[in-house]
Interface confidence: medium
């Protein structure tokens, strides 16, 4: 396990002529945010393929307004690193995708608009634990400067974060319920300090202040033997090996949740469901009243006037948990109406709308016939999220407001004269010509050069184009 870290140093117009002055142009103020996506291997993957190694989103940068006369600056950037945790081995070879997004803040129909400003995709080789790698990339007329690295999280070490190291304080022999494993590194640098009193023999920690029990032991300090352990039978002659692994040490082993909280495993970690009156990562915060503001994300706190009475958080739509601390998987609710594409950016939800729709959730049907009059007797026809006006004869244009002059294109051939008619146009042919558009010459002997049965025209028909 480890973390990929990306630091954006600058983003701005690239050198040379034709470079944009600003991402905002005349649109009003805007701000930037970045998205990083990691894909394994060096294969050229489709842009839509998942970010299998992980993805992260930056906060939004400061608001930027273009100064018309000022030189084009580097743009104000969001603070902090972008961090992408990875659970498994670091692959060494990977595809790095960095997207720069623009959020336009000017007043407009549908509210702030988000658009992808630049996207760089690079295949890279990188060993975990190495120094920061620096890079400059161009994306269209933009230039992005950034650094990145991969680092392991203890107890994992090595270029792929696959070797485990033993804290200096750890025992050098296998404890109960442990099976032999590949030798561990001799020492970790900066080992975490476990909870005071945590058994050196039967407990371990990956984060300061915790005490997680080896298989076969329990209790807050891992001092209490479990009467039956499925792992004890694993011990054998080779169990004196200096390196030991907990056989799949579950994150919930020894129940890290305090105060009666129940533990459930999540990928690479755990989650505590706390009883009322307690919260925190391990339900370690207690004696909470409504005055302490225990309800997150706009939850409404009820009861809990004193530490002895329980409070209840009434969560707003979109949040759940005893303290409204858990966000509902928002895209699973299909919040983007009318076929819009949902993007959960973490700090916000975005919808990419189909043509004809707008608004934060694509709820605004721009081409709805309702209230959209087609002028001059035209009728509105809806279909597939779009509308069009079917205009009465003699009228045209998007809303049938334009008077159509059927004679404007000079449709009558051979000097025929065109007359606009309520149902189209009429050609008055010059001597020697006939047909709806005066296109046929009349032979001197009076016999028409028409085919025997011209489609849609019989001798004697009025010469009118419908």
């Amino acid at each position: 396990a480890g973390v990929f870290e990306l630091q954006i140093h600058s983003f701005g117009p690239g050198p040379g002529p034709g470079a944009p002055r600003s991402p905002c142009s005349a649109r009003g103020p805007c701000r930037l945010f970045f998205r990083v996506c990691l894909k394994p291997g060096l294969s050229e993957e489709a842009a839509e393929s998942p970010c299998a190694l992980g993805a992260a989103l930056s906060a939004r940068g400061p608001v930027y307004t273009e100064q018309p006369e000022a030189p084009a600056p580097d743009l104000p950037l969001p603070n902090g690193l972008l961090q992408v945790p990875f659970r498994d081995a670091w692959p060494g070879t990977f595809s790095l995708i960095i997207e720069t997004w623009r959020e336009e803040l000017g007043d407009q129909i549908g509210g702030p608009a988000w658009s992808l400003l630049a996207r760089v995709t690079r295949r890279r080789r990188l060993a975990a634990g190495g120094p920061w790698a620096r890079d400059i990339q161009r994306a269209g007329a933009w230039e992005l400067r950034f650094s990145y690295r991969a680092r392991c999280e203890l107890p994992a070490v090595g270029t792929a974060c696959t070797r485990l190291c033993r804290p200096r304080s750890a025992p050098s022999r296998c404890g109960p319920g442990l099976r032999p494993c590949a030798p561990l590194e001799d020492e970790c640098e900066a080992p975490p300090v476990c909870r005071a009193g945590c058994s050196l023999e039967h407990g371990f920690c990956e984060q300061p202040g915790e005490c997680r029990c080896l298989e076969g032991w329990t209790g807050p300090l891992c001092m209490v033997p479990v009467s039956t352990s499925s792992c004890l039978g694993l011990r054998g002659p080779s169990s004196t090996t200096t390196g030991c692994l907990v056989p799949g040490p579950g994150p919930c082993d020894g129940n890290p949740c305090a105060n009666g909280g129940s533990c459930s495993e999540t990928p690479g970690s755990f989650e505590c469901t706390c009883p009322r009156g307690f919260y925190g990562l391990r339900c370690e915060v207690s004696g909470v009243t409504c005055a302490d503001g225990p309800c997150f994300n706009g939850g409404l706190c009820v009861g809990g006037a004193d530490p002895d009475s329980a409070y209840i958080c009434h969560c707003p739509p979109g949040f759940q948990g005893s303290n409204c601390e858990k966000r509902v998987d928002r895209c699973s609710l299909q919040p983007c109406r009318n076929g819009g594409l949902c993007l959960d950016l973490g700090h916000a939800l975005r919808c990419r709308c189909r043509a004809g729709f707008a608004g934060p959730r694509c709820e605004h049907d721009l081409d709805d016939c309702a209230g959209r009059a087609c002028a001059n007797g035209g009728t509105c026809v809806e279909g597939g999220g779009a509308h069009r006006c079917s205009c009465a004869l003699g009228f045209g244009g998007r809303n049938c407001r334009e008077r159509a002059d059927p004679c404007a294109a000079r449709p009558c051939a051979h000097g025929g004269r065109c007359y606009a008619h309520f149902s189209g146009l009429v050609c008055a042919c010059a001597p020697g010509y006939m047909g709806a558009r005066c296109e046929f010459p009349v032979h001197p002997d009076g016999v028409s050069a028409l085919p025997a049965a011209p489609p849609g025209l019989r001798p004697g028909d009025p010469q009118r184009y419908l």
Epitope: P112, G298, Q334
Partner: antibody
Framework: EVQLVESGGGLVKPGGSLKLSCAAS????????IHWVRQAPEKGLEWVAY????????YYADTVKGRFTISRDNAKNTLFLQMTSLRSEDTAMYYC??????????????WGQGTSVTVSS | DIQMTQTTSSLSASLGDRVTISCRAS??????LNWYQQKPDGTVKLLIY???RLHSGVPSRFSGSGSGTDYSLTISNLDQEDIATYFC?????????FGGGTKLDIK
């Protein structure tokens, strides 16, 4: 406790103007979109207007478009509805209602008690 | 605009009854259907959002179901305090529209 308190209603002549206010408390006002909804006497509920948390997205019902203006002052936790060119059919109880946190559902999860507007000569 | 129709404008039932109120949309609203209760004093409360999700603080005797264009609100064990008018509202496409309401009283 979430509270929304409307004010500013009253009797006004046709063609006249009125400005309604909605004072919010008990939640982070700047995190939520807010709706105005009205109810004519002995009738159902009719959505009137909506403004997003930051004020960037504004929507109106066709019946009030061009006559009503919704706005908000996040520093003062207050929502406004400026009504002009009032007609007799605008006579109703006007409610402000809080939208949901992420505008996923477009619910109105907490409502004020309403303020009455009567348009009559 | 999407029209919301509550065919039953008033309904009488006995205490303890199971009551179902229906609502139909003029086109598919993809489950973005909310139910509100308006008490005789004019107080309005959200009961159910997104077709079937119970709003916080609402008794569990209220439930919602439906999809596409047809939706319903069920009160499983009618209580005296449930005397009110119930409105459905679609949150799928602007403008947001309400049903005409169903007034519920006790037999």
């Amino acid at each position: 406790e979430v509270q929304l308190v409307e004010s500013g209603g009253g009797l006004v002549k046709p063609g006249g103007s009125l400005k309604l206010s909605c004072a919010a408390s008990g939640f982070t006002f700047s995190d939520y979109g807010i709706h105005w909804v009205r109810q004519a006497p002995e009738k159902g509920l009719e959505w009137v207007a909506y403004i997003s948390s930051g004020g960037y997205t504004i929507y109106y019902a066709d019946t009030v478009k061009g006559r009503f203006t919704i706005s908000r002052d996040n520093a003062k936790n207050t929502l406004f509805l400026q009504m002009t060119s009032l007609r007799s059919e605008d006579t109703a109880m006007y409610y402000c209602a809080r939208g949901d946190y992420d505008d996923i559902f477009y619910t109105m999860d907490y409502w004020g008690q309403g303020t009455s507007v009567t348009v009559s000569s | 605009d999407i029209q919301m129709t509550q065919t039953t404008s008033s309904l009488s039932a006995s205490l303890g009854d199971r009551v179902t109120i229906s609502c139909r949309a003029s086109r598919d609203i993809t489950k973005f259907l909310n139910w509100y209760q308006q008490k005789p004093d004019g107080t309005v409360k959200l009961l159910i959002y997104y077709t079937s999700r119970l709003h916080s603080g609402v008794p569990s005797r209220f439930s919602g179901s439906g999809s596409g264009t047809d939706y319903s609100l069920t009160i499983s064990n009618l209580d005296q305090e449930d005397i009110a008018t119930y409105f459905c509202q679609q949150g799928n496409t602007l403008p947001w529209t309400f049903g005409g309401g169903t007034k519920l009283d006790i037999k």
